[in-house]
């Protein structure tokens, strides 16, 4: 089988405030079963943004119907942005257990938010 | 107007170092990623390889992957490709081509907006 | 790799389609040749963009993982080849198709 690819194609995105963000990720192998996660930033203090398998997230929804089992298109649009989105989003997959297990991200899309226009 | 001028083409001996560079201009250079494409004569195009708005990351085609090495300087708006080791199947015309966006250098091709008008590489003993 | 038809053909002001598959979701562009070494000319980009000087009879469409290039109203000046290009899974590196010769009649 394929070695899985978390594919983020987006280096940067700009939106102006109030606005929405489409953030793209898509992966090349249902392998291995578990969730997608989104979050912004890394390490110990980043804050998570989507669980395909929690909820809701009021300001999220997601590009494709990630409830299918074929699906490989987990990007998502986040609602009504402010400065405070501003950040670096990460995709991850996670490997089903108990608890889930990171297993491996993409390699981030900065989004900068533009002052609203006047 | 967006223009970017490709030189060091010419004929080049197998084994050594082929070098071209691209001058850009008519855009805030360090904005945009970069790529170079070739086209071998009577075949189709090729992705050669591509670099990201801030040189953080490239990316290169099969063919010349451990070969190539892609380069910015943002100073100056220029890339610059070198192949080591030339060969034969290397000769034709390359192109230089700049991204809509900023990166990732990978995923640029389908994401290019504007062409040089080529510079032609025959490498020959 | 990119899988695009070798050729096509049509007569002027009939509608032309090429699809591109096999480069994942995003992203798509295509890419004219009117003669071999000639530089290529962008006439869509990221899936459905086209840059302001391209006619608006170009335009382009993604499903899935396919992407549809169309020309409405095909004008004898559009014989050429079109390329399409995006990001091969396989190598992790961008690719193009073989590209695909159009024919006006």
């Known amino acids: 089988e394929e070695e899985l690819q978390i594919i983020q194609p987006d280096k940067s995105v700009s939106v102006a405030a109030g606005e929405s963000a489409i953030l793209h990720c898509t992966i090349t192998s249902l392998f291995p079963v578990g969730p997608i996660q989104w979050f912004r930033g890394a390490g110990p203090a980043r804050v998570l943004i989507y669980n395909q398998r929690q909820g809701p997230f009021p300001r999220v929804t997601t590009v494709s119907e990630t409830t299918k089992r074929e699906n490989m298109d987990f990007s998502i649009s986040i609602s009504n942005i402010t400065p405070a989105d501003a950040g670096t989003y990460y995709c991850i997959k996670f490997r089903k257990g108990s608890p889930d297990t990171e297993f491996k991200s993409g390699a981030g899309t900065e989004l900068s938010v533009r002052a609203k226009p006047s | 107007a967006v223009t970017l001028d490709e030189s060091g083409g010419g004929l080049q001996t197998p084994g050594g170092a082929l070098s071209l560079v691209c001058k850009a201009s008519g855009f805030t250079f360090s904005s945009y990623a970069m790529g170079w494409v070739r086209q071998a004569p009577g075949k189709g195009l090729e992705w050669v390889a591509g670099?990201?708005?801030?040189?953080?990351?490239?990316n290169y085609g099969p063919a010349v992957k451990g070969r190539a090495t892609i380069s910015r300087d943002n100073g100056q708006s220029t890339v610059r490709l070198q192949l080591n080791n030339p060969r034969a199947e290397d000769s034709g015309t390359y192109f230089c081509?700049?991204?809509?966006?900023?990166?990732?250098?990978?995923?640029?091709?389908?994401?290019?907006?504007?062409w040089g008008h080529g510079t032609e590489v025959i490498v020959s003993s | 790799a990119l899988t695009q038809p070798a050729s096509v053909s049509a007569n002027p002001g009939e509608t032309v389609k090429i699809t591109c598959s096999g480069g994942g979701i995003y992203y798509y562009g295509w890419y004219q040749q009117k003669s071999p070494g000639s530089a290529p000319v962008t006439l869509i980009y990221e899936n459905d963009k086209r840059p302001s000087d391209i006619p608006s009879r170009f335009s382009g469409s993604t499903s899935g993982s396919t992407n549809t290039f169309t020309i409405t109203g095909v004008q004898a000046e559009d014989e050429a080849v079109y390329y399409c290009g995006g990001y091969d899974s396989n190598t992790t590196s961008g690719i193009f198709g073989a590209g695909t010769t159009l024919t006006v009649l």
């Open positions: 670099i990201d708005d801030d040189g953080s990351t490239a």
């Open positions: 081509a700049k991204a809509s966006v900023t990166g990732w250098s990978a995923h640029i091709s389908g994401r290019l907006d504007t």
